[in-house]
């Protein structure tokens, strides 16, 4: 059978239960429910999942049983709408329940909250966690799925199953170790950081599909898969793109059972045909399903075939360019993108998409001109500035990162972005700028050939975080413009923003700059966030402050914190020295 050509099933829920198995079925339904109803208590979700699972089992036993022929959206939506406190907890989301499918599911999707009002996850003591793990492993792991899914409503569900498997393995190993904490904590830190990155990457895929459409996502996928599988034929890449688009459309649309099932099929197809796809897949394909799918998604680029011909001959010099373009525009542009991308693993995907867009725009214009060939003959010259712009930007910023180190590089970006878009909330500016700053440690260590794909594609992910957070509470026309005009030009759009001259500085509030002894017990990371929050507020009060002025104030602030944390009476020190610091800072900044 073809990868996604299944016979029609009398009962969709029975079909997915049988394909996925009970354990994965239950986990995926829990993720789906937690991503939709993000405020519901864990116990309520477990109850709903158990009810759905029992129902699925009746359908497996008899596909003709009552309601077994209903769609998954109908079954799941009906179940979600039985929640008694829907109106009190979710307000207008309860109105979704008055709608029929497919409108009801679309309504639920629109109410997913990228920044839900949930308490920060606090990690208990290792012994407490190990006891909970041993007492009830199943509940412990379900709780992990629930807590991640409700905080990350677009997390890639089959990948979350992979994280849960690693989470379980970490506890299984480390709770038996001599030094439990030394074994477990680094593993949990790694899972947390990888999880945040995975969530953000998937959020960009969903935004691409939902805000810019399937064609935009497919173009991204053609470019990325052509870089990764440069020896594969265009038709092979096209087939993988079509299947991958289906998988992500399903997951982004809340169809998690179908998504996980189709992702498994795609991994199976790739491994069965790896000789035609990539020489780098062998190790991945020897792994169990969840590891295999993850491994394929992260696999390194295959080597480029030797002696690839010049692209100019057929895409610029040929007299048949317009004829070929007119015959099948998207196939021709797809081939252009495929051929360009497989030759350029050193370019970011977004750069490749800018080049393809430039090529398309040129052909649209020139193929209607009197002398098309004369008109499009210099199209490759137009690529040069597009390539040089990210190259120069990365070079400059990596030099700055190497000079400053991560924390101070983040601070430079905090100042830069607060001046560009001062209306954005301080927590969002801190979170986004900190993540932008991580590009330094993540990418600047790479050789030139790997820097751009690492840096610019990572920045696309981070700027999408800004876009989705800003969309919830729009405050800046400039952010809206950069986020909505062009997916591939978001980063250049933000880079091009200058200081917002229309911004009226924020009123000074001493409370914002009042600190207490509790700062002394914070982790280094939390302390940095406190200082960076103060820095953003400073810039919002004094957007025209120079780097030197801001540096002086921040240095004084760091010295103040260090001094008071060493004092015998910390709270008194913070109160008295804090007043002096505020006064000195106001004077230094002319507030």
């Amino acid at each position: 059978r073809g990868v996604f050509r299944r016979d029609a099933h009398k009962s969709e829920v029975a079909h997915r239960f049988k394909d996925l198995g009970e354990e994965n079925f239950k986990a995926l339904v829990l993720i789906a429910f937690a991503q939709y109803l993000q405020q519901c208590p864990f116990e309520d979700h477990v109850k709903l999942v158990n009810e759905v699972t029992e129902f699925a089992k009746t359908c497996v036993a008899d596909e003709s049983a009552e309601n077994c022929d209903k769609s998954l959206h109908t079954l799941f939506g009906d179940k979600l709408c039985t929640v008694a406190t829907l109106r009190e907890t979710y307000g207008e989301m309860a109105d979704c329940c008055a709608k029929q499918e497919p409108e009801r599911n679309e309504c639920f999707l629109q109410h997913k909250d990228d920044n839900p009002n949930l308490p920060r996850l606090v990690r208990p003591e290792v012994d407490v966690m190990c006891t909970a793990f041993h007492d009830n492993e199943e509940t412990f792991l379900k709780k992990y799925l629930y807590e991640i899914a409700r905080r990350h409503p677009y997390f890639y569900a089959p990948e979350l199953l992979f994280f849960a498997k690693r989470y379980k393995a970490a506890f299984t190993e480390c709770c038996q170790a001599a030094d439990k904490a030394a074994c477990l904590l680094p593993k949990l830190d790694e899972l947390r950081d990888e999880g945040k990155a995975s969530s953000a990457k998937q959020r960009l895929k969903c935004a691409s599909l939902q805000k810019f459409g399937e064609r935009a996502f497919k173009a991204w996928a053609v470019a990325r898969l052509s870089q990764r599988f440069p020896k594969a034929e265009f038709a092979e890449v096209s087939k993988l793109v079509t299947d991958l688009t289906k998988v992500h459309t399903e997951c982004c649309h809340g169809d998690l059972l179908e998504c996980a099932d189709d992702r498994a099929d795609l991994a199976k197809y790739i491994c069965e045909n790896q000789d035609s796809i990539s020489s780098k897949l062998k190790e991945c394909c020897e792994k169990p399903l969840l590891e295999k799918s993850h491994c394929i998604a992260e696999v390194e680029n295959d080597e480029m075939p030797a002696d690839l011909p010049s692209l100019a001959a057929d895409f610029v010099e040929s007299k048949d360019v317009c004829k070929n373009y007119a015959e099948a525009k998207d196939v021709f542009l797809g081939m252009f993108l495929y051929e360009y991308a497989r030759r350029h693993p050193d370019y970011s995907v977004v750069l490749l998409l800018r080049l393809a867009k430039t090529y398309e725009t040129t052909l649209e214009k020139c193929c209607a001109a009197a002398d098309p060939h004369e008109c499009y003959a210099k199209v490759f010259d137009e690529f040069k500035p597009l390539v040089e712009e990210p190259q120069n930007l990365i070079k400059q910023n990596c030099e700055l990162f190497e000079q400053l180190g991560e924390y101070k590089f983040q601070n430079a970006l905090l100042v830069r972005y607060t001046k560009k878009v001062p209306q954005v909330s301080t927590p969002t500016l801190v979170e986004v700028s900190r993540n932008l700053g991580k590009v330094g440690s993540k990418c600047c260590k790479h050789p030139e050939a790997k820097r751009m794909p690492c840096a610019e594609d990572y920045l696309s992910v981070v700027l999408n975080q800004l876009c989705v957070l800003h969309e919830k509470t729009p405050v800046s026309d400039r952010v809206t413009k950069c986020c909505t005009e062009s997916l591939v030009n978001r980063r250049p759009c933000f880079s091009a923003l200058e200081v917002d001259e229309t911004y009226v500085p924020k009123e000074f509030n001493a409370e914002t700059f009042t600190f207490h002894a509790d700062i002394c017990t914070l982790s280094e990371k939390e302390r940095q966030i406190k200082k960076q929050t103060a820095l953003v507020e400073l810039v919002k009060h004094k957007p025209k402050a120079t780097k030197e002025q801001l540096k002086a104030v921040m240095d004084d602030f760091a010295a103040f914190v260090e001094k008071c944390c060493k004092a015998d009476d910390k709270e008194t020190c913070f109160a008295e020295e804090g007043k002096k610091l505020v006064a000195a800072s106001q004077a230094a900044l002319g507030l």
């Epitope: 034929e233 265009f234 038709a235 045909n273 000789d275 035609s276 070929n324 196939v331 021709f332 252009f336």
Partner: nanobody, 125 residues
Framework: EVQLLESGGGLVQPGGSLRVSCAAS????????MGWFRQAPGKEREGVSS????????FYTNSVKGRFTISRDNSKNTLYLQMNSLRAEDTAVYYC??????????????????WGQGTLVTVSS
């Protein structure tokens, strides 16, 4: 819509060389992916090599890499397969095929839409 005509087959000694050609006529956009397949007696048809007439990328099955070279002359709408270091196991009827680049895959003959009649290549001493 599209006609493909192979030529150049014949008898050649092991270690020898041969060039087969395929002339295409009709709507050539429909032939922007072209390939060579072969079928030995009692065996399934297998992909040998393919080329995109836009972009010029080439693909080979493992058993012929380094020995066979596919090329095309767009101005003449002709496809070539230069076969060097021929072996007895290369004996087969060689078919020219064409299709859309969005569909054609060398490992799957059903993804090619148009076929020639074939030309026999015999490698024997």
């Amino acid at each position: 819509e599209v006609q493909l005509l192979e030529s150049g087959g014949g008898l050649v000694q092991p270690g020898g060389s041969l060039r087969v050609s395929c002339a295409a006529s009709g709507n050539t956009y429909l032939t922007s992916c072209m390939g060579w397949f072969r079928q030995a007696p009692g065996k399934e048809r297998e992909g040998v090599s393919s080329i995109y007439t836009v972009g010029g990328s080439t693909f080979y099955t493992n058993s012929v890499k380094g020995r066979f070279t596919i090329s095309r002359d767009n101005s003449k709408n002709t496809l070539y397969l230069q076969m060097n270091s021929l072996r007895a196991e290369d004996t087969a009827v060689y078919y020219c095929a064409a299709g859309s680049p969005a569909r054609c895959r060398l490992r799957d003959p059903t993804t090619f839409d148009y076929w020639g009649q074939g030309t026999l290549v015999t490698v024997s001493s």
